[in-house]
Interface confidence: low
C-alpha cells in the first residue's frame, strides 16, 4: 500500500518565500515519520526534512542550504521556504516515509509543484562599492 500525496500544481514565490503544503492520504498522528521535499525532475536535491517521533520535538532541517521550516497537520506537512533565489525556480516533490508502526510505508510519486521564484533577485551585495566618479 502506498500513501497518496497531493500538491498544488504551481506556486509563485513573490518575496522569495513560499508555503508548500503536502497533503497525504494518511494520518500522521502518533506515527514516526520522515517528510521531505525534493527539488528537480530527478528529485536529486533534498531541500528540507521534517522528522517526527514520540520521544523528541519535531525536527526540521535542510542539509542543502535551504532556509526552511515545517508545520505538521493531521494529514499534511507544510514546508515554508524562505530566501529562495530566482534560479531555484523548479519542480518540487513531496515525499513521506512512515517508519513506525510497521509496516514501513512511503508514497506514490506525486505530480510535484512548480515553484516560480519571482520577486527580488537575491544577489549578494559587493563588500566594497566601486570607485565613485568625480
Amino acid at each position: 500500500n502506498k500513501i497518496l500525496v497531493k500538491q498544488s500544481p504551481m506556486l509563485v514565490a513573490y518575496d522569495n518565500a513560499v508555503n508548500l503544503s503536502c497533503k497525504y492520504s494518511y494520518n500522521l498522528f502518533s506515527r514516526e515519520f520522515r517528510a521531505s521535499l525534493h527539488k528537480g525532475l530527478d528529485s536529486a536535491v533534498e531541500v528540507c526534512v521534517v522528522y517526527g517521533n514520540y520521544s523528541q520535538q519535531l525536527q526540521v532541517y535542510s542539509k542543502t542550504g535551504f532556509n526552511c521550516d515545517g508545520k505538521l497537520g493531521n494529514e499534511s506537512v507544510t514546508f515554508y521556504l524562505q530566501n529562495l533565489y530566482v534560479n531555484q525556480t523548479d519542480i518540487y516533490f513531496c515525499k513521506i516515509e512512515v517508519m513506525y508502526p510497521p509496516p514501513y510505508l512511503d508514497n506514490e510519486k506525486s505530480n510535484g509543484t512548480i515553484i516560480h521564484v519571482k520577486g527580488k533577485h537575491l544577489c549578494p551585495s559587493p563588500l566594497f562599492p566601486g570607485p565613485s566618479k568625480p
Epitope: L28, F29, S30, R31, E32, G52, N53, Y54, S55, Q56, Q57, L58, L72
Partner: nanobody
Framework: EVQLLESGGGLVQPGGSLRLSCAAS????????MSWARQAPGKGLEWVSW????????YYADSVRGRFTISRDNSKNTLYLQMNSLRAEDTAVYYC?????????????RGQGTLVTVSS
Amino acid sequence: EVQLLESGGGLVQPGGSLRLSCAASGFTFDSANMSWARQAPGKGLEWVSWIEAPGVQTYYADSVRGRFTISRDNSKNTLYLQMNSLRAEDTAVYYCARSPFGPLYGFDYRGQGTLVTVSS
C-alpha cells in the same frame, strides 16, 4: 507541583456520550500543549488527541476522529474530551497529559486516569 486530575469517566452504552474533564494545577496551563491518551486493558498507551496552548490547533487519532472533540478553558485551567458515538473498543483508562512539544510526541506529566467502560 504539577497535578492533573481527570474526571467524568463511567459506564456508558454503545452509541452514548461522555465528557471527560482534566483539572490542571502547578504550571502555567494557558501556555501548555495538552493531550489525551488512553490505555485499554492489556494494551499499550494510545494517543487520542492533542491541543495547542491557545486552543486553536487540534489533532486526532484515526480511531476517534469525527467522534471525539478536544477543547480547553484556559480561564478554568481545564482540559476536556467530548466523546460521542462511543464503541466497545473505546473502553480504556483515559489520561490527561501535558505535552510540551507537538502532537506526536511524549508527555512530561500525566494524571492518574479515569476509567471509561462502554458496554450494553
